[in-house]
């Protein structure tokens, strides 16, 4: 009988040790979670405060309605211009309306004057159709005024208040476009 009691006592003690271990593990886990929670909260706080302080467009970009525009200060060929825009999370300018065209040409007049600026328009070599970079067709009023007499690929650019076309391998300034951040605060 005494042996039985002693065995039960040992089993209870073993159970107690296991529970203490589990409690210790749980405490450690809780502490780890609390630390992670703190880190997450700090991260979110930072993100929120930077979002709160940030304007809809990055520095040196111009805003018009839901878009931000960047007018380059360097020349490059059309394909490199596209890559430069992608590095900034944007694409070459896609002009959707006459209003947008007027805004762009008006802004360019103020900034730089009458230079050439690549936009995201190119001519399909097979069909001769003009297409924006996302595959959509320009509205009839926004087709390049002159057809380039080039055997090479032909791309669109803005000069003064006109859309024109040129060999994609010529060097020009370029304009990038991205969506403006919506302020939800």
């Amino acid at each position: 009988k005494l042996l039985q009691v002693s065995t039960i006592a040992m089993q209870q003690q073993e159970k107690l040790i296991q529970q203490e271990r589990a409690l210790l593990n749980f405490t450690e886990w809780k502490r780890s979670c609390a630390l992670q929670m703190k880190y997450c909260q700090a991260f979110m706080q930072n993100s929120l405060s930077s979002a709160h302080n940030s304007s809809p467009c990055p520095n040196n970009w111009i805003q018009n309605r839901e878009s931000c525009y960047y007018v380059s200060e360097i020349w490059s060929i059309w394909h490199t211009s596209q890559e430069n825009c992608l590095k900034e999370g944007s694409t070459l300018l896609q002009i959707e309306s006459k209003e947008e065209m007027d805004f762009i040409t008006g802004s360019l007049r103020k900034i730089k004057g009458s230079y050439d600026y690549w936009v995201g328009l190119s001519q399909d070599g097979h069909s001769g159709r003009w297409l924006w970079q996302d595959g959509s067709s320009p509205s009839p009023g926004l087709l390049p005024a002159e057809r380039s007499q080039s055997a090479n690929q032909v791309c669109g650019y803005v000069k003064s208040n006109s859309l024109l076309s040129s060999n994609c391998s010529t060097w020009k300034y370029f304009i990038c476009e991205k969506y403006a951040l919506r302020s939800s605060v």
């Epitope: 890559e83 992608l86 590095k87 900034e88 999370g89 944007s90 694409t91 970079q133 996302d134 595959g135 476009e177 991205k178 969506y179």
Partner: nanobody
């Protein structure tokens, strides 16, 4: 550093379809856009399609209307759906991540269009 892993390449008949995937890992918060390039033997590497974090897309003239680039909601995987494939689409397809300071490339996946 950003690591990129492509998959989905293979042999397909003209007119067929393939879907390429590119999974990004590492410092994915630095990525502003992701794109697909291709390089055929003896030719220069060319941009096929790209997508920005904001969802803007850009395509090479030769693939417009046939290829579609997209990304998952988390933004760390980009897909290239290639339809109506032609023999001239045969190339090694590379994934690229665009950041302000650096560009990161995947190892590439072979796409062969042949009957």
């Amino acid at each position: 550093q950003v690591q990129l892993q492509e998959s989905g390449g293979g042999l397909v008949q003209p007119g067929g379809s393939l879907r390429l995937s590119c999974a990004a890992s590492g410092r994915i918060f630095d990525i502003n856009a992701m794109g697909w390039y291709r390089q055929a033997p003896g030719k220069q590497r060319e941009l096929v399609a790209a997508i920005t974090n904001g969802g803007q897309t850009t395509y090479a003239d030769s693939v417009k209307g046939r290829f579609t680039i997209s990304r998952d909601n988390a933004g760390n995987t980009v897909y290239l759906q290639m339809n109506s494939l032609r023999p001239e689409d045969t190339a090694v397809y590379y994934c690229k991540a665009f950041t302000r300071s650096d560009d990161y490339w995947g190892q590439g996946t072979q796409v062969t269009v042949s009957s």
